[in-house]
Amino acid sequence: LQDLCSNCPAGTFCDNNRSQICSPCPPNSFSSAGGQRTCDICRQCKGVFKTRKECSSTSNAECDCISGYHCLGAECSMCEQDCKQGQELTKKGCKDCCFGTFNDQKRGICRPWTNCSLDGKSVLVNGTKERDVVCGPSPADLSPGASSATPPAPAREPGHSPQ
């Protein structure tokens, strides 16, 4: 017996109520591939979600987050509250980055400043809660008569604290 369902295009479903005849997906549902036996319910972008792309008979709706939130997870499955630069989101809300750490985005965690000395360099611009340090030339490069050739970077030693 031929599988008549394989003839049903995207946007339809193979209607077992009537001998595998193709029927259009009902409103607010979709089938993104041919040969489907059911249509999937369209995603609804409610609450902290807003619609980026409307659902059609062949593709699901796509959501974004409303202002003050950002997407997390595949296909924006969650919305997480934004914080200010220089902050990170904790269970108790947005908290300033601890000294020696920074966050230059509205999302994510505070990260340690770069340890310039690990690369044999010196701190050119100090770090803040919002910005990483800027590393400059090594102290040796700044001394009079120093060779223009860059010396090899010293081996990394554990335990160096941020500059």
Epitope: N7, C8, P9, A10, G11, T12, N17, R18, S19, I21, C22, S23, P24, C25, P26, P27, N28, S29, S56, S57
Partner: antibody, heavy 123, light 108 residues
Framework: QVQLQESGPGLVKPSETLSLTCTVS????????WSWIRQPPGKGLEWIGR???????NYNPSLKSRVTMSVDTSKNQFSLKLSSVTAADTAVYYC?????????????????WGQGTTVTVSS | EIVMTQSPATLSLTPGERATLSCRAS???????LSWFQQIPGQAPRLLIY???TRATGIPARFSGSGSGTDFTLTISSLQPEDFAVYYC?????????FGQGTKVEIK
């Protein structure tokens, strides 16, 4: 609300191809099947076939060898071509929205029809 | 294909009378996919009943449908002058969709 309007030549010569277009207004052609039905003078209704917005078709076996349907979603139109016509193809030709389900899977029949266009096959 | 047979071919009645139209399918049809249409001369068919018994939008309550399996009935409880027309049953349970040959309701 959705409205349908058939258009095309009212007179076609025998052995030639009948071509009709149905224009959908007041709604989108997308997400539905669309049917063609004809009615010879003084006779009953005959279903010719249907087309989905992707171009997928089902034809009445009695006409299948002569029928071609197509769809132009950009113009909100679908079309019927019937080749090698004879006097027996003289009829009023109607386009209609084919049956569909609502969100609760209640099924609706052919609920919207065009007013019909008369096609006469004669030399 | 499913053959739909309507009876009688013609029904001669006076306004105010009850009209009972029959439709028989050559094989069982799920009632969800049985429709009735009204056609006034010179006009396109109009959907009256879908799902064998549900009135379409704007259809007066004097029209009712019933039946299941192979036997279906359209009833007009009290004929109005505008009801004299041809009535067709139609199935879209199995391809190809098919119509009955029609019942003409005429003024006696």
């Amino acid at each position: 609300q959705v409205q349908l309007q058939e258009s095309g030549p009212g007179l076609v010569k025998p052995s030639e191809t009948l071509s009709l277009t149905c224009t959908v207004s007041g709604g989108s052609i997308s997400s539905y099947y669309w049917s063609w039905i004809r009615q010879p003078p003084g006779k009953g209704l005959e279903w010719i076939g249907r087309i989905y917005t992707s171009g997928s078709t089902n034809y009445n076996p009695s006409l299948k060898s002569r029928v071609t349907m197509s769809v132009d979603t950009s113009k909100n139109q679908f079309s019927l071509k019937l080749s090698s016509v004879t006097a027996a193809d003289t009829a009023v030709y109607y386009c209609a929205r084919d049956g569909w389900y609502d969100e609760d899977y209640n099924y609706y029949g052919m609920d919207v029809w065009g007013q019909g266009t008369t096609v006469t096959v004669s030399s | 294909e499913i053959v739909m047979t309507q009876s009688p071919a013609t029904l001669s009645l006076t306004p105010g009378e009850r009209a009972t139209l029959s439709c028989r399918a050559s094989q069982s049809v799920s009632s969800n996919y049985l429709s009735w249409f009204q056609q006034i001369p010179g006009q396109a068919p109009r959907l009256l009943i879908y799902g064998a018994s549900t009135r379409a939008t704007g259809i007066p309550a004097r029209f009712s449908g019933s039946g299941s399996g192979t036997d279906f009935t359209l009833t007009i409880s009290s004929l109005q002058p505008e009801d004299f027309a041809v009535y067709y049953c139609q199935q879209d349970y199995d391809l190809p969709w098919t119509f009955g040959q029609g019942t003409k309701v005429e003024i006696k």
